[in-house]
């Protein structure tokens, strides 16, 4: 009874319906189901298509541009659970640009275990306001349901029985409105007593066994579940897999030989991207977690003594890292057998991404070449690099080669980083922001001092655009208010005071005191500091009455810690020596102030003597909020209410709806009744800055999602004929 069919791998079905038949015997899709990009399909093509065996999808369901599909009620009549183990951009259910879809119709969908729902740009889609998503998933506030026909109030959603004046479907309250709940004109939404939690219930409302998820055919019986809350084993739902079984893919129990088969299939297939499954913590998982290595005799992950080695052999002896994607291919590697060439010109959140992917590398057997990486400010993302062997060298016998890196300012923080270069020389040319002192420090630390020849380190083209500071600036005065910080620092003058062009004050929000000047920075603006240019003070001839330069930082956030440092801006001197000074990074917190107003107040009267008031915390607490003040005042009754003849014909029922606080901007737009505008009495208020900002954020969020969708969905055609799913491994 439980999962009567097969367990199928994740599927990507596109272009036409032929591969849809692979779903025929599937009860569980272990992975995701994507049905998309079918432009020639018509409604009649879907008439006889049904997959009643499909009960559960472990990852997500995505439908995108499938023409002719009007409802999912026949396609997936028994889909009960979407687990969301892996999500599509935080969503477990995505319905996007489905031009002919009129209703969802997933009338047996009872639980989305993780993730939320995105239903967007479906201009025929109705029966959305009749679904109580809070009965299906926890994070309803993260749902994104906009730009559907339902938004325009053009849907005449009629639940079963309504046409005959009956209410057949359960009604639940959302935003104070009592609404009948249904998926289609012939299918109610099944609503269980809330005491049943997510376990589901029988038609009489008897709660399913606590190991069930979503539904069952009988209460109190873990063998009569439709799907399992925890794990499935031999026709029964169990809390945890007992020995000799292992947890697999977060939903079922498998034995050792199952896991071993997966391991060997991958090992023997030589297919890229497959996983040699291992056993750890009673789970059969794709790879050992960091800090563990596999014992090949029993597939068990055992703790490494010291850091775990993961040797990565580079094809053709070298690899060029020119994007985050190419860096990801080396994720987890600790030893690089070959040479690395870093050539990164741009990207998003680069420093963090590079550290996540290259930060475990401890050893490179060949050379390391940093070439035209305009986006790099520091090499600190090679957090653990301790050894460059130089067994193969770049032409000219170089084991470390840095050429034309326009924004490279720091190699490593040499006070915290040790690097040994066993053989080979250093090469530094055209690194205008990299001070020679930094290069000389590397020579000392790495043990390469004396190996370089005259032109290996160019004196003229390294550090020629940098302020290579060698003195420490100290702050002499700091004062704070809730939105300002006043700073002064000790005066600094280079030998020729005319060389001082001014100071640069750097600051950024820093919740933790662990900021360094270059960490997390790249030349593309990621995690960048805010920089203020400050003119030098007037120079006094009396050294005792020197003006202390300073700056009043304005427009800061209250109750926020800022990291701040200041450095000099000096001209390039003729003697090939640039003077300068820089402060340490200091941390200063602004004062607290009044919080902004609490957000989204809703009031509902739940009886003749009570009003329930709910609100969200203010967007800007501006300090630690300890309590809220609630004021109320009795209002005089409107005399009209007493004078009105309630028997007048044509009197409309009063509507007491308010714009629910969690609705999207779009639906609020449509809620403004159109005749209000045309009456000419009211005109819409101009949008506030925060509204405009919110709309910009909203549209930016929409674009980000669309970009993500297109990047994932549109893949180049494989020249060889593909087999089955794009990713046939258990995903």
């Amino acid at each position: 009874h439980l999962y009567p069919g097969e367990v199928c791998p994740g599927m990507d079905i596109r272009n036409n319906l032929t591969r849809l038949h692979e779903l025929e015997n599937c009860s569980v899709i272990e992975g995701h189901l994507q049905i998309l990009l079918m432009f020639k399909t018509r409604p009649e093509d879907f008439r006889d298509l049904s997959f009643p065996k499909l009960i559960m999808i472990t990852d997500y369901l995505l439908l995108f541009r499938v023409y002719g599909l009007e409802s999912l009620k026949d396609l997936f009549p028994n889909l009960t659970v979407i687990r969301g183990s892996r999500l599509f951009f935080n969503y477990a259910l995505v319905i996007f640009e489905m031009v002919h879809l009129k209703e969802l119709g997933l009338y047996n969908l009872m639980n989305i275990t993780r993730g939320s729902v995105r239903i967007e740009k479906n201009n025929e889609l109705c029966y959305l306001a009749t679904i109580d998503w809070s009965r299906i998933l926890d994070s309803v506030e993260d749902n994104y349901i906009v730009l559907n026909k339902d938004d325009n109030e053009e849907c005449g959603d009629i639940c079963p029985g309504t046409a005959k004046g009956k209410t057949n479907c359960p009604a639940t309250v959302i935003n104070g409105q009592f609404v009948e709940r249904c998926w289609t004109h012939s299918h109610c939404q099944k609503v269980c007593p809330t005491i049943c939690k997510s376990h589901g219930c029988t038609a009489e409302g008897l709660c399913c066994h606590s190991e069930c998820l979503g539904n069952c055919s009988q209460p109190d019986d873990p063998t009569k579940c439709v799907a399992c809350r925890n794990f499935y084993l031999d026709g029964r739902c169990v809390e945890t897999c007992p020995p000799p079984y292992y947890h697999f893919q977060d939903w079922r129990c498998v034995n050792f030989s199952f896991c071993q088969d997966l391991h060997h299939k991958c090992k023997n297939s030589r297919r890229q991207g497959c996983h040699q499954y291992v056993i750890h913590n009673n789970k059969c998982i794709p790879e050992c977690p960091s800090g563990y290595t596999m014992n090949s005799s029993n597939l068990l992950c055992t703790p490494c003594l010291g850091p775990c080695p993961k040797v990565c052999h580079l094809l053709e002896g070298e690899k060029t890292i020119d994007s985050v994607t190419s860096a990801q291919e080396l994720r987890g590697c600790t030893v690089i057998n070959g040479s690395l060439i870093i050539n990164i010109r741009g990207g998003n959140n680069l420093a963090a991404e590079l550290e996540a992917n290259l930060g475990l590398i401890e050893e490179i057997s060949g050379y390391l070449k940093i070439r035209r990486s305009y986006a790099l400010v520091s090499l600190s993302f090679f957090r653990k690099l301790r050894l460059i062997r130089g067994e193969t060298l770049e032409i000219g016998n170089y084991s470390f080669y840095a050429l034309d890196n326009q924004n490279l300012r720091q190699l490593w923080d040499w006070s915290k980083h040790n690097l040994t270069i066993t053989q080979g020389k250093l090469f530094f040319h055209y690194n205008p922001k990299l001070c020679l002192s930094e290069i000389h420090k590397m020579e000392e630390v790495s043990g390469t001092k004396g190996r370089q020849e005259r032109n290996d380190i160019a004196l003229k083209t390294n550090g020629d655009q940098a302020s290579c500071e060698n003195e420490l600036l100290k702050f002499s005065y700091i004062r704070t208010s809730f939105d300002k910080i006043l700073l002064r620092w000790e005066p600094y003058w280079p030998p020729d005071f005319r060389d001082l062009l001014g100071f640069m004050l750097f600051y950024k929000e820093a919740p933790y005191q662990n900021v360094t000047e270059f960490d997390g920075q790249d030349a593309c603006g990621s995690n960048s500091w805010t920089v203020v240019d400050i003119d030098p003070p007037l120079r006094s001839n009396d050294p005792k009455s020197q003006n202390h330069p300073g700056w009043l930082m304005r427009g800061l956030k209250p109750w926020t810690q800022y990291a701040i440092f200041v450095k000099t801006l000096v001209t390039f001197s003729d003697e090939r020596r640039t003077y300068g000074a820089k402060s340490d990074i200091i941390y200063v917190q602004t004062d607290a102030t009044n919080p902004s107003v609490p957000l989204d107040p809703i009031s509902v009267s739940n009886s003749s003597s009570q009003i329930i008031l709910k609100w969200k915390p203010p967007s800007d607490p501006n300090g630690n909020i300890t309590h809220y003040l609630v004021f109320w005042e009795r209002q005089a009754e409107d005399s009209e209410l007493f004078e009105l003849d309630y028997c007048l014909k044509g009197l409309k029922l009063p509507s007491r709806t308010w714009s629910p606080p969690f609705e999207s901007e779009d639906s609020q737009k449509h809620n403004q009744s159109e005749y209000e505008d045309s009456a000419g009495e009211c005109c819409s208020c101009p949008k506030t800055d925060s509204q405009i900002l919110k709309e910009l954020e909203e549209s930016s969020f929409r674009k980000t999602f669309e970009d993500y969708l297109h990047n994932v969905v549109f893949v180049p055609r494989k020249t060889s004929s593909g087999t089955g799913a794009e990713d046939p491994r258990p995903s």
């Epitope: 359960p170 009604a171 639940t172 309250v173 009592f178 609503v191 007593p193 809330t194 005491i195 049943c196 219930c201 029988t202 009489e204 409302g205 008897l206 709660c207 399913c208 066994h209 606590s210 190991e211 209460p219 109190d220 019986d221 873990p222 809390e239 739940n606």
Partner: antibody, heavy 118, light 107 residues
Framework: QMQLVQSGAEMKKPGASVKVSCKAS????????ITWVRQAPGQGPEWMGW????????NYAQKFQDRVTMTTDTSTSTAYMELRSLKSDDTAVYFC???????????WGQGTLVTVSS | AIRMTQSPSTLSASVGDRVTITCRAS??????LAWYQQKPGKAPKLLIY???TLESGVPSRFSGSRSGTEFTLTISSLQPDDFATYYC?????????FGGGTKVEIK
Amino acid sequence: QMQLVQSGAEMKKPGASVKVSCKASGYSFSDYGITWVRQAPGQGPEWMGWISGYNGNTNYAQKFQDRVTMTTDTSTSTAYMELRSLKSDDTAVYFCARARGVWMFDNWGQGTLVTVSS
Amino acid sequence: AIRMTQSPSTLSASVGDRVTITCRASQSISTWLAWYQQKPGKAPKLLIYTTSTLESGVPSRFSGSRSGTEFTLTISSLQPDDFATYYCQQYNSYPLTFGGGTKVEIK
């Protein structure tokens, strides 16, 4: 024949504790939950809480949360309800009932009278 | 907690009468309501659940219905065995709550 047999009447002083037992027979104990309901003289029943026969998970009414503990012994198919810090208004008949689907109390024990008096 | 208000608290009737007992919930409980019958010195006995479904073995003269948050237990023709106290119980949400009871006595 399915039945629930409860322990005998108890007389307690204020501040004391009482532990009532409920022995089940005629069905598989671990397949169903046990709920405890009390009824003060001349009053309606009052739900106290529920315990799963499968894994011992409990759900107590907030009113009793700090004073009640429900347990099971699957080897003897017995459920127990202990109520601490007794007050005079805890005087009532305490019933155990088999809970089908958590809330359907289809079989009841005969009740145990607990009298709290100084 | 959801309050269940039963009315009347006492009802005098004769054998053969049609009897109606009402139970009102302080908030929506959908159809998740049960009716119990209790005789003096005995435990309650389940009669009806999910508003209108008869527990097996319960005579068909008992029926239940609902209008919004108001629920009704009807005995179409009162029998001597039916003189007892009747309680409604909601099981939509915790804590499960009972009504105060309606005592049906002989007129």
